[in-house]
Amino acid sequence: EPLSLAPESLEVSIDSARQCLHLKWSVHNLAYHQELKMVFQIEISRIKTSNVIWVENYSTTVKRNQVLRWSWESKLPLECAKHSVRMRGAVDDAQVPELRFWSNWTSWEEVDVQSSLGHDPLFVFPKDKLVEEGSNVTICYVSRSHQNNISCYLEGVRMHGEQLDPNVCVFHLKNVPFIRETGTNIYCKADQGDVIKGIVLFVSKVFEEPKDFSCETRDLKTLNCTWAPGSDAGLLTQLSQSYTLFESFSGKKTLCKYKSWCNWQVSPDSQEMYNFTLTAENYLRKRSVHLLFNLTHRVHPMAPFNVFVKNVSATNATMTWKVHSIGNYSTLLCQIELYGEGKVIQKQNVSVKVNGKHLMKKLEPSTEYAAQVRCANANHFWKWSEWTRRNFTTAEAAPSEAPDVWRNVKSVQGHCVVTLFWKPLSKLQANGKILFYNVVLENLDRPSTLKLLSIPAPANGTELTLDRCSYQIHVTANNSVGTSPASVIAVSGDPGNKEVEEERVKGTEDGFCLSWKPQPGDVTGYVVEWCERPGDPLCDLQWKNLGPNTTSTVVSSDAFRPGVRYNFRIYGISTERIPYLLEKKTGYSQELVPSDNPQVLMSNLTSYSFTLSWKDYAAESQPGFVQGYSLYLKSKAARCLPGSEKAVLSDDSICCKYKIDNPKQKTFVVENLQPASFYEFFLTPYTSVGEGPQGAFTKVTTPDEYSHI
């Protein structure tokens, strides 16, 4: 009879937590040093040996007395039923074709976990089972009492199962969902008594593969690989994840310490190509992602260092820096950005091996700048380095513009009092800190006579008392470096305040639109002046310089207020730099209704009439141009008198209204009255917007016809 190679010494152990049967056996009859391929047929039965539920052929290479192992994971918790295992073997090797037949079966090895359970009346399995959502799970209860009816509940909902035997019932849960991090609750309880048992089924969210897997080097010595782990499993402590990096060209492997990054030491043997597999693994499954790249194409340089800004003048500065080497022959492309007032104003790219240098031109004097530099691999761009930034301030230069100068001329006791005003130079014009202003007075009648006044900043004007002569005034602004061009204004012996008719202008949301007639002679420009706070002694004089070809402008200001009258003067500037008054304009940015009513005097009271008169009052103080007056008259009469019409007052009372549409009119005769009659009157001005406030009516009674006898 041919030699039979049968499995012997079969042992079966269990792992309840994993619902696994572990088989161990060996083959004794092999010759020494003989190694054969064999196939083992394994049968697993449940409850009774005739009920075979699993058959599997397991192929492996066998040596004499080698311990062979095989595991089987049961869908049903092992505590739910008795399991039996047997096996047989056959040689499956070309070396010994004559041995290709099955050996005898081993005897059945029985695994009965139930027998080791305690004497409790009820058990529920599996305990602490961990599965992924969407899985199918089998649970069971084992009852020690035939009499008792057992009900099982999944999250409070009764489940229906199949009876395996009188003591065991099985429940098949399909496509289990993730409910919560503390797991899914399953309870079983008996109808009689207070027997109740529960288990937790831990359902994890599906373990996702890592996303955005990427590797880069900063120094060609270490690769830093990063990834975004898949979403959380949703359980507190059950599922630890491990991440492994494997590089196929070198055959090296490393277990990553962190869940989203890992460092890899670059081979000293100048390996250029890398083929990484990142494997994420938890108790339930493995996920892998791959990445193939050339090392030199994944260089993320370190930030430039030794960055300096040197040779800073008023308009130029030089930036120098060093870069960290990324190999012997590589060139870095560096990007320089110049910031002024928070915005990029210059951008430049420079190729660098070790030292970088860049001249920044066309800078503004006395200005704060920030320059920053970053670099990337010029040959194979991957990523820019971080920026390295330096702040610097350019040197001062002499002011570039003449101050904007204006004047106010008053005649006081035979002298000419000139108030000079100037606007501070803008940052761009000042080119540094203005320290003082020089005012030079040149008497045009005695040209050799010059007088210098030095006025410390931040003054914005000065007052000069001059004789009746003509003067030319030169104003310059000065900083630590030098002097600005001079602003020249002339004052003649004649104050030049000739009478000019005032014209009304209407303001809009945008401001006042002013226009004037072009001058026939030579003018070097025009000036529009106004007060931002009329009526205030300080007035806050404002002016606007305009070119010689300009005949209109819009004056706008946030200071303009509704109901305030603004007066504008338009001056022409002669070739001798003497201002002369051309036009006057007056108006409101927005008219309002009159703020008060005039005081009215009544006179000439007769049986048939009386006369009303009122004082003129300052038009300047009115919140709009008065266009006329409304006179309201109340009487017992049903009809309104000629010249008046019916009107309804705000208190719904009815009266008669006379409209006086001449604002200059200051008297009015109320006629056609009845003798011995009672009247009430009230006078209010109106503007384009409406009438003044409604005030108290004045009472009057006409005498009877005979009262004078």
Epitope: D128, G156, R180, N185
Partner: antibody, heavy 117, light 107 residues
Framework: EVQLVESGGDLVKPAGSLTLSCLAS????????MAWVRQTPEKGLQWVAN????????YYLDSLKSRFTISRDNAKNTLYLQMNSLRDEDTAVYYC??????????WGQGTLVTVSS | DIVMTQTPLSLSVSPGETASISCKAS??????VAWFRQKPGQSPQRLIY???TRHTGVPDRFSGSGSGTDFTLRISRVEADDTGVYYC?????????FGQGTKVEIK
């Protein structure tokens, strides 16, 4: 009769240590999750820790994790709570509780732990 | 952490009436809620689990309802023995947390 009896409560100084025990009877101890819950007048009931059937998984209130250790000995039907670096705010009645899952169907009578200098 | 807020904090009921205690969770806890009663000088006893399942031996006068964030314990036909402090507990997420308790007294 199902019973849980706590012991080990005592007066202890701050930074001291204490071990609480809970002896279970009347049921198969290894078939149940077990827990410690404490109670103070200020904070009411506060879950401290849980342990699964065989002690392979433990769960803690985060703020106590570094100082408290829950363990069990199924052969002795006993649950333990080892408390280190005790603080004034750990003063409470400590209950041992049986859990079918995470809610507690049987509670012991409690043991008082007082932390004071 | 999930905060369990009970209302009212105290309740006085006459025998035979119905008492209602509300428990609001600061996040969705589906039905992982239990109710306990603690009588003076005693340890807590479980009444309800999984929001609405009565514990063995608990009279049907006690009923629990709700899911998500709003839960209610109702005690109908209140008896003198129902006095005590009632607590809700969530076990949907760690840390497991309890409500602050509702004191029920019988007039």
């Amino acid at each position: 009769e199902v019973q849980l009896v706590e012991s080990g409560g005592d007066l202890v100084k701050p930074a001291g240590s204490l071990t609480l025990s809970c002896l279970a009877s009347g049921f198969t101890f290894s078939d149940y999750y077990m827990a410690w819950v404490r109670q103070t007048p200020e904070k009411g009931l506060q879950w401290v820790a849980n342990i699964n059937y065989d002690g392979s998984s433990t769960y803690y209130l985060d703020s106590l994790k570094s100082r408290f250790t829950i363990s069990r000995d199924n052969a002795k039907n006993t649950l333990y709570l080892q408390m280190n670096s005790l603080r004034d705010e750990d003063t409470a009645v400590y209950y041992c509780a049986r859990g079918l899952t995470w809610d507690f169907d049987v509670w012991g009578q409690g043991t008082l732990v007082t932390v004071s200098s | 952490d999930i905060v369990m807020t009970q209302t009212p904090l105290s309740l006085s009921v006459s025998p035979g009436e119905t008492a209602s205690i509300s428990c609001k969770a600061s996040q969705d806890v589906d039905t992982a809620v239990a109710w306990f009663r603690q009588k003076p000088g005693q340890s807590p006893q479980r009444l309800i689990y999984l929001a609405s399942t009565r514990h063995t031996g608990v009279p049907d006068r006690f009923s629990g309802s709700g899911s998500g964030t709003d839960f209610t314990l109702r005690i109908s036909r209140v008896e003198a023995d129902d006095t005590g402090v009632y607590y809700c507990q969530q076990y949907s997420r760690f840390p497991l947390t309890f409500g602050q308790g509702t004191k029920v007294e019988i007039k």
